[in-house]
């Protein structure tokens, strides 16, 4: 079978401050099993934005029903955007591992730009 790919179709997204940003991500397969996580930035200092497995992310909602057994849409919405949210967001597939899940494949990233509210 084809190896899983993580597709972020939007290279960039422009959102006005105070609005909601939609960051799109799909996987091409359900295998290997393991969670999706969203990060802002890359490398060791990246910031976790959303973790499918656990955690409380009050500004983030998922576009699709992630409890569907055949779900491959991992797009998210981030509410009440501010200029501090600007950056490149990566959708990352992990495969299960012990004791920790292992990063398997990352999307190419989506750059979020924030347009200031007109005064």
């Amino acid at each position: 079978e084809e190896e899983l790919q993580v597709i972020q179709p939007d290279k960039s997204v422009l959102v006005a401050a105070g609005e909601t940003a939609t960051l799109r991500c799909t996987a091409t397969s359900l295998i290997p099993v393991g969670p999706i996580q969203w990060f802002r930035g890359a490398g060791p200092g990246r910031e976790l934005i959303y973790n499918q497995k656990e955690g409380h992310f009050p500004r983030v909602t998922t576009v699709s029903d992630l409890t569907k057994r055949n779900n491959m849409d991992f797009s998210i919405r981030i509410g009440n955007i501010t200029p501090a949210d600007a950056g490149t967001y990566y959708c990352v597939k992990f495969r299960k591992g012990s004791p920790d899940d292992v990063e398997f494949k990352s999307g190419a990233g989506t750059e979020l730009s924030v347009r200031a509210k007109p005064s």
């Epitope: 359900l30 295998i31 099993v33 499918q52 029903d65 409890t67 569907k68 057994r69 495969r95 012990s98």
Partner: antibody, heavy 117, light 108 residues
């Protein structure tokens, strides 16, 4: 505290129907997938059916077309409509909350369905 | 579809270590869990996601996986651990949950 309380079991004749219910409390029901698992007397566990938070449904082959899982998120209740019952359906039926990866973390106490002529 | 195979029975003395194995499924497409069931009671989840222990389960319960075999380990077994233990799997290829036949743990 997470609680799942099944009801609706009973003694029925072959070919008859029942509607099982599972009332939940202690968590945001609308955010979780749920399942029904059954256990025949003296036997092991068998997964019967699952439903996503949004209502997508899944069944084991042996009950497809006879059983229907549903949920009412406004009533915090999970249902299993069981039709055309046979003796092989005699079991304790448990409802269970699913984890993010479709395993089970919390279980109800079960409701007994007995099919006998 | 796949089957999960576990031994029908395991016996251990109090304070010793009990290991219950479960084989079947494919590592890359299957998540595993362990469920404890005492006579006349509902199942209780003691391990999920191969090796994750719920917060209310004693630390003596642990799970591990290697290839297509997963293992439930109970360190320092106590009399109250006597029960049936079922391994369960979720297969991401078929969307189906499967259970092993169960293992009766006897504390001598």
């Amino acid at each position: 505290d997470v609680q799942l309380v099944e009801s609706g079991g009973g003694v029925v004749r072959p070919g008859e129907s029942l509607r099982l219910s599972c009332a939940v409390s202690g968590f945001r029901f609308s955010s979780y997938a749920m399942s029904w698992v059954r256990q025949a007397p003296g036997k092991g566990l068998e997964w019967v059916s699952g439903i996503s938070s949004g209502g997508d449904t899944y069944y084991v082959d042996s009950v497809k077309g006879r059983f229907t899982i549903s949920r009412d998120n406004s009533k915090n209740t999970l249902y299993l409509q069981v039709n055309s019952l046979t003796a092989e359906d005699t079991a304790i039926y448990y409802c269970a909350r699913e984890t993010w990866n479709h395993l089970f973390d919390y279980w109800g106490l079960g409701t007994l369905v007995t099919v006998s002529s | 579809s796949y089957e999960l195979t576990q031994p029908p029975s395991v016996s251990v003395s109090p304070g010793q270590t009990a290991r219950i194995t479960c084989s079947g499924g494919d590592y890359y497409s299957t998540y595993y869990a362990w469920y404890q069931q005492k006579p006349g009671q509902a199942p209780v989840t003691v391990i999920h996601s191969d090796d994750k222990r719920p917060s209310d389960i004693p630390e003596r319960f642990s799970g591990s996986s290697s290839g297509t075999t997963v293992t439930l380990t109970i360190s320092g077994v106590q009399a109250e651990d006597e029960a049936d233990y079922y391994c369960g799997g979720y297969d991401g290829r078929t969307y189906i949950n499967t259970f092993g036949g169960g293992t009766k743990l006897t504390v001598l």
